[in-house]
């Protein structure tokens, strides 16, 4: 009797179990009672990444420099091109279809994690004892200056945006 289900890497058509085309190849003709499935390799700018019965290969992704994209990994007949962003930019989505500039951490915030081609800058508030007085995509929160180690005293307290101001110790005592 004709099969109702087929083995792995096969598909059912016209009561026949036909072999799927291997990754990197597209379907030209289904198998028959007397012939095998016929497949053809994808062209240079195309790919198929699974065992398939597709009659057309997929176009490789284009890494558009106008969108800040560049090729991270060139596609093959079995894999798509992987795009990443140019220096100073990161992807707007997992599929990396466009890029935006890295975020800068405002004064009072420091860089917790520097941005990559696929992830934005992660900022964190400067905790007590640390500050950042610049807007930067690289700078971490810096510790307040320790006046004591310089044999100085705090003349003006630090904030999350400013360092302490040290001054000489007052030698006149009551």
């Amino acid at each position: 009797e004709p099969p109702t289900a087929c083995r792995e890497k096969q598909y059912l058509i016209n009561s026949q179990c036909c072999s799927l085309c291997q990754p990197g190849q597209k379907l030209v003709s289904d198998c028959t009672e007397f012939t095998e499935t016929e497949c053809l390799p994808c062209s240079e700018s195309e790919f198929l990444d699974t065992w398939n019965r597709e009659t057309r290969c997929h176009q490789h992704k284009y890494c558009d420099p106008n969108l800040g994209l560049q090729v991270q990994q060139k596609g093959t007949s079995e894999t798509d091109t992987i795009c990443t962003c140019e220096e100073g930019l990161h992807c707007t989505s997992e599929s990396c279809e466009s890029c935006v500039p890295h975020r800068s951490c405002l004064p009072g915030f420091g860089v917790k994690q520097i941005a990559t081609g696929v992830s934005d800058t992660i900022c964190e508030p400067c905790p007590v004892g640390f500050f950042s007085n610049v807007s930067s995509a690289f700078e971490k929160c810096r510790p307040w200056t320790s006046c004591e180690t310089k044999d100085l005293v705090v003349q003006q307290a630090g904030t999350n945006k400013t360092d302490v101001v040290c001054g000489p110790q007052d030698r006149q005592r009551a």
Partner: antibody, heavy 112, light 112 residues
């Protein structure tokens, strides 16, 4: 239902060219399958002569050397056999077939 | 070429009794995908061959289940579990794994 029907002269003179046509109904010859010519000399077994594929490419039996040509007319859904330089040994019933469906066969006699 | 040898060349069977025909190939008919393209045909007197079995063991549509095919590699068998009067004719195996396609020489089945 797929149907095949052979047509052509029943008598061919020695050294001339045998020409037969197979008309297919119920299925397009460009869709899939290999479209074959098979012959059977009187009182003998079956001999595969060659095929034309759905894409128009061919394969022939080497025993027929360079005498055989199979072509097609997709507008009429027909494929044809030409066998040149025939001799009495080419007298046979000629079948066109998709291998699951066959024509009823046409008898060709080679005689002067 | 794959030479196909059928045995016996003729057999006479009482209705209701089983029959078995062997077909042996000079080379393996299994292709690189592990598929084997061997067909069995019955040619009744004065008719075109009709497909019984394809791919070794698959019955073609409308073929009674008393016909079964088996085998692998180079050795294949057609079995008729209970022969009926309408089964008379010549049985042929045909391999379509390798070009040129080749038929066995035929086995004539008669009713006792």
């Amino acid at each position: 239902e797929v149907q095949l029907q052979e047509s052509g002269p029943g008598l061919v003179k020695p050294s001339e060219t045998l020409s037969l046509t197979c008309t297919v109904s119920g299925y397009s010859i460009t869709s899939n399958y290999y479209w074959n010519w098979i012959r059977q000399p009187p009182g003998k077994g079956l001999e595969w002569m060659g095929y034309i594929r759905y894409d128009g490419s061919n394969n022939y039996n080497p025993s027929l050397k360079n005498r055989i040509t199979i072509s097609r007319d997709t507008s009429k859904n027909q494929f044809s056999l030409k066998l040149s330089s025939v001799t009495a040994a080419d007298t046979a019933v000629y079948y066109c077939a998709r291998l699951d469906y066959w024509g009823q066969g046409t008898t060709v006699t080679v005689s002067s | 070429d794959a030479v196909m040898t059928q045995t016996p060349l003729s057999l006479s069977v009482t209705p209701g009794q089983p029959a078995s025909i062997s077909c042996r190939s000079s080379q393996s008919l299994e292709n690189t995908n592990g598929n084997t393209f061997l067909n069995w045909y019955l040619q009744k007197p004065g008719q075109s061959p009709q497909l019984l079995i394809y791919r070794v063991s698959n019955r073609f549509s409308g073929v009674p289940d008393r016909f079964s095919g088996s085998g692998s590699g180079t050795d294949f068998t057609l079995k008729i579990s209970r022969v009926e009067a309408e089964d008379v004719g010549v049985y042929y195996c045909l391999q379509v794994t390798h070009v040129p396609f080749t038929f066995g020489q035929g086995t004539k089945l008669e009713i006792k």
